[in-house]
């Protein structure tokens, strides 16, 4: 969370950004909010990126002005125009690329004053894991798969019954490069599992952490998975 203040004569406004993460090959959002101003025509939003000449995006007088936009962002950016009056200056970025990572500045000017705040935008790949029982194995085992991760994550197993146990000796993890030669498929197999226990497969890199849980009983298999972005305010 970064809060910036701006001073314009006696006036300053608070601009707030959150460290954001973009999943490459998807649309992303760079979050920025400011003190609302009901006079839409008096609001100017400028997004800049460190090391890039020209603007990432500009919105003023109630509409986009792309006249000074850098070619790298042409056709890819948008603000949420209907939410600007309530103080939302967040930027939508189409088809996030690894090269979009960096430090961005959200600069705001309204009739109340001006202000800006920086934002660290991280890019990578992260996806939900899916755990299945591997009945083909010689002993009962679990297979945890997640289709897209970058940078290479760590994988760890845990169980509800054997809390604190180290499963590295009874698991095998592999990383298979996907066809675009950047992201990787994560596959981890846990051997010698017992029924009536809940196992968790945790995949984590510096951008995201994902957990898949599976509970195997005599009568059913229950699954749950969740994903959280790290350092996002």
């Amino acid at each position: 969370l970064i809060i910036g203040f701006g001073i314009s004569g006696k006036h300053f406004i608070t601009v707030t950004t959150f460290t954001s993460a973009g999943n490459i090959g998807e649309d992303g959002t760079l979050s920025c909010t400011f003190e609302p101003d009901i006079k839409l025509n008096g609001i100017v939003i400028q997004w800049l990126k460190e090391g890039i000449k020209g603007l990432v995006h500009e919105f003023k007088e109630g509409k986009d002005d792309l006249s000074q936009q850098h070619e790298m962002f042409r056709g890819r950016t948008a603000v949420f125009a209907d939410q600007v009056v309530v103080g939302n200056a967040s930027l939508r970025l189409k088809n996030v690329q690894l090269t979009d990572a960096g430090t961005y500045t959200c600069y705001i000017r309204t009739s109340k004053g001006k202000g800006n705040a920086n934002l660290e935008y991280k890019t990578g790949a992260f996806s939900m894991p899916e755990i299945n029982v591997d009945y083909n194995a010689s002993s009962e085992s679990l297979r945890c798969e997640a289709p897209r991760w970058f940078p290479q994550p760590t994988v760890a197993w845990a169980s509800q019954v054997d809390q604190g146990a180290n499963f590295s000796e009874v698991s095998n993890t592999s990383f298979e490069l996907n066809s675009e030669n950047v992201t990787m498929k994560v596959v981890s197999v846990l051997y010698n599992v017992t029924i009536n226990n809940t196992y968790s497969c945790m995949i984590e890199n510096d951008i995201a952490k994902a957990t898949g849980d599976i509970k195997v009983t005599d009568s059913e298999v229950k699954r749950r998975s969740q994903l959280q972005l790290l350092n996002s305010g």
Epitope: N23, I24, G25, E26, D27, H57, K63, D64, L66, Q69, F73, R74, G75, R76, T77, A78, V79, A81, D82, R92, K94, N95, A125, S127, P147, R148, N178, S179, E180, T183
Partner: antibody
Framework: QVQLVESGGVLVKPGGSLRLSCAAS????????MSWIRQAPGMGLEWVSY????????YYTDSVKGRFTISRDSAKNSLYLQMNSLRAEDTAVYYC?????????WGQGTLVTVSS | EIVLTQSPGTLSLFPGERATLSCRAS???????LAWYQQKPGQSPRLLIY???SRATGIPDRFSGSGSGTDFTLTISRLEPEDFAVYYC??????????FGQGTKLEIK
Amino acid sequence: QVQLVESGGVLVKPGGSLRLSCAASGFTLSDYYMSWIRQAPGMGLEWVSYISSSGSTIYYTDSVKGRFTISRDSAKNSLYLQMNSLRAEDTAVYYCARDGVGFDYWGQGTLVTVSS
Amino acid sequence: EIVLTQSPGTLSLFPGERATLSCRASQSVSSSYLAWYQQKPGQSPRLLIYAASSRATGIPDRFSGSGSGTDFTLTISRLEPEDFAVYYCQQYGSSPLYTFGQGTKLEIK
């Protein structure tokens, strides 16, 4: 050079199924958002379905939800549209298109006719 | 749901004249996500303009795009015989994800 070639369009009876293919060359399919767009005879363009570069996000227009499935095979650099429970109103030329900045490349289209 | 309305439905002009085609959105569209296409009979559509005002590769400079918010315009400064076709505007990012206008037919007078 960039090329998209659709195939699979035929005459099919209402309620039938069909799988359209789109073979891409000159670029890597998984670097771009890809869509299927259709055009009924004498009518305008209608977006049908989309798959993100990552392959993780998929959308459909309301009229085909639950009936059509978009997919891709990165190894074959191909895009597919599985069409089930076909209706007369699905009759159209189906195009696959690459979304670079706008739909910058289109296939030649394949005609799907749904009629008894 | 966002609706793009193109006008006029049909535009009849002489070669050499200036053509102005309009695309109006039912709600605000990001300029970045607004494109124009040309389609000739029996052919696939061709991207003319992206990001509201940027010409696509190989498009002659007689084609220009402008506008923002809800009102966008495609202008052909001096019509050539090959310009007579159907023109579509298209947006990305709202619901539905992609939307096309119904088209404007540009015909020879």
